[in-house]
Amino acid sequence: MGCDRNCGLIAGAVIGAVLAVFGGILMPVGDMLIEKTIKREVVLEEGTTAFKNWVKTGTTVYRQFWIFDVQNPDDVAKNSSKIKVKQRGPYTYRVRYLAKENITQDPEDHTVSFVQPNGAIFEPSLSVGTEDDNFTVLNLAVAAAPHIYQNSFVQVVLNSLIKKSKSSMFQTRSLKELLWGYKDPFLSLVPYPISTTVGVFYPYNDTVDGVYKVFNGKDNISKVAIIESYKGKRNLSYWPSYCDMINGTDAASFPPFVEKSRTLRFFSSDICRSIYAVFGSEIDLKGIPVYRFVLPANAFASPLQNPDNHCFCTEKVISNNCTSYGVLDIGKCKEGKPVYISLPHFLHASPDVSEPIEGLHPNEDEHRTYLDVEPITGFTLQFAKRLQVNILVKPARKIEALKNLKRPYIVPILWLNETGTIGDEKAEMFKTQVTGKIKLLGMVEMALLGIGVVMFVAFMISYCACKSKNGK
């Protein structure tokens, strides 16, 4: 009778020990299984979860625009006053709704190449007005022409054309014209076959970005989605030295198992450069734990503050010998046009940049860029890309429309907020397929370990108690 009880207690302790051991073993084994599954599913090839979402994003992406409406155009042109601006917006477009095209796998170097078609659909319900709303903005062609042709002879010719076309330093244009293009009356007078259509994003619709060639991760998962080449080249040919490198992914995803200590590098064709984001905080996105990576102020610093940025300073005059910060001259990438990129409202820019402009209110929360990355898969489940397009306008003695300017201005034209968030349905699916399974496995591991240990300890205590009782 005593033996039965003792045997039972020992059997219980053994079962507990087995469960605990099994739970303990399941931890590394389970992690290995998860890792194996993740590695298999994030590879960019037909049939994987990643590939399906990569070809055509499951996220609805919106691009909101705020236009800087100039309130005192005549005063600026005549007296070189501060430019008073008032932002108007948002005007919202749906973007990135087209699937990647010309997808070609290269099994030899484990890459996949593609182009990303561009398209934008106006969303009136998410906008403050229509595409026909008018704005007073800098005359893009008049500002750019003397910058491109810094030749005094040609500037005299251009002046004749500007006067003939009744163009001036500022112009009134509709949203649709400003963004997507309009026939410029001054350029239309040039008697050679040149492009006479001007627009901040012209040409956009029916164009493609790429060709991108990215690693598919088949041979090395730590390289998945990393750009191998862009437009057939490993470098951009826009910047000197290492600034010209194409680093990281396109920010839609990153190699899996993202750690907080990691710097996420990505290339953005919008700003013609590679940039990086650093860990900011942990966030719960629709029940999915994500890491919020933010673009640090350091990325926009002057070479004085961040020596790594020295090769992004390609011009000494406007940058005050590379001491100004927060604006990036991307002219080399825009056929020599004087285009400068910054954060909205000149967030993180030096005071000399924003001083000639009135009406700007930079705000970290509204104007910073961030990526919410699910750390196990490396997928970006939510993002907000914010940037501002500015045009440099300088005094030009030979051009009457610009001859009264006493200083150069980096004139804000518009800023945009491109956002995407995983949909509720997709989030549920993601939780079920990824985080849910991982959570469940973790719970099973802990339950087995917990129950096993408790059983083992309880039965062993009972056994020992029983033994001592019998001994008496």
């Epitope: 810094q150 030749n151 005094s152 002879f153 040609v154 005299v156 010719v157 002046n159 004749s160 054309l161 006067k163 003939k164 007078l189 040039v190 008697p191 050679y192």
Partner: antibody
Framework: EVQLVESGGGLVQPGGSLRLSCAAS????????IHWVRQAPGKGLEWVAW????????YYADSVKGRFTISADTSKNTAYLQMNSLRAEDTAVYYC??????????WGQGTLVTVSS | DIQMTQSPSSLSASVGDRVTITCRAS??????VAWYQQKPGKAPKLLIS???SLYSGVPSRFSGSGSGTDFTLTISSLQPEDFATYYC?????????FGQGTKVEIK
């Protein structure tokens, strides 16, 4: 086909006047602007005057400033060079030429102006 | 005014020779230089604009190089019809100015 034809050259006494014409076809002079370039016998090319597009500004070489006047009649698609107070050193073949960006892609055949007593 | 100094003022060469003519500007004219060919009794003909851009219809044996103040016209293999006088011209600033010319003669 683009063509420029000069006329009006000839023999003139020092201090005299002459008006050269440059008739253009195949393009509108208004949208390009017209230059006059001269070449003294056995010498090199010398830029003389320019009328910018759309009746824009006029520019002259220092050697002719105040004596020569360039003009254009857009209805006739013709440019003119009015030459007053002519001197012996103004003796040359005068070419009209088309230019937009400052290089001359089309030239006339030239008209000879001789200033001699 | 910007002075354009051409060298040599004349040269003798044979058919098939490679010929180089240089032109120096008295100040930086970027790439705003044109080259012309002129035969006796004829108007000049444009060969090259923007220092390096071959004008349409001009044979590819003609090429231009240079930027800033030093420019070169090269004829890779001289042909009988290439014997003429060549002029450089800056089209950066008014007054537009020409070099004094280089006469290419038969050896």
């Amino acid at each position: 086909e683009v063509q420029l034809v000069e006329s009006g050259g000839g023999l003139v006494q020092p201090g005299g006047s002459l008006r050269l014409s440059c008739a253009a076809s195949g393009f509108t002079i208004d949208s390009f602007g017209i230059h006059w370039v001269r070449q003294a016998p056995g010498k090199g090319l010398e830029w003389v005057a320019w009328i910018a597009p759309y009746g824009g500004e006029t520019y002259y070489a220092d050697s002719v400033k105040g004596r020569f006047t360039i003009s254009a009649d857009t209805s006739k698609n013709t440019a003119y060079l009015q030459m007053n107070s002519l001197r012996a050193e103004d003796t040359a073949v005068y070419y009209c030429a088309r230019s937009f960006f400052g290089y001359f892609d089309y030239w006339g055949q030239g008209t000879l102006v001789t200033v001699s007593s | 005014d910007i002075q354009m100094t051409q060298s040599p003022s004349s040269l003798s060469a044979s058919v098939g020779d490679r010929v180089t003519i240089t032109c120096r500007a008295s100040q930086d004219v970027s790439n705003w230089v044109a080259w012309y060919q002129q035969k006796p009794g004829k108007a000049p003909k444009l060969l090259i604009s923007y220092a390096t851009s071959l004008y349409s219809g001009v044979p590819s044996r003609f090429s231009g190089s240079g930027s800033g103040t030093d420019f070169t016209l090269t004829i890779s293999s001289l042909q009988p019809e290439d014997f003429a006088t060549y002029y450089c011209q800056q089209h950066s600033n008014a007054p537009l100015t020409f070099g004094q010319g280089t006469k290419v003669e038969i050896k």
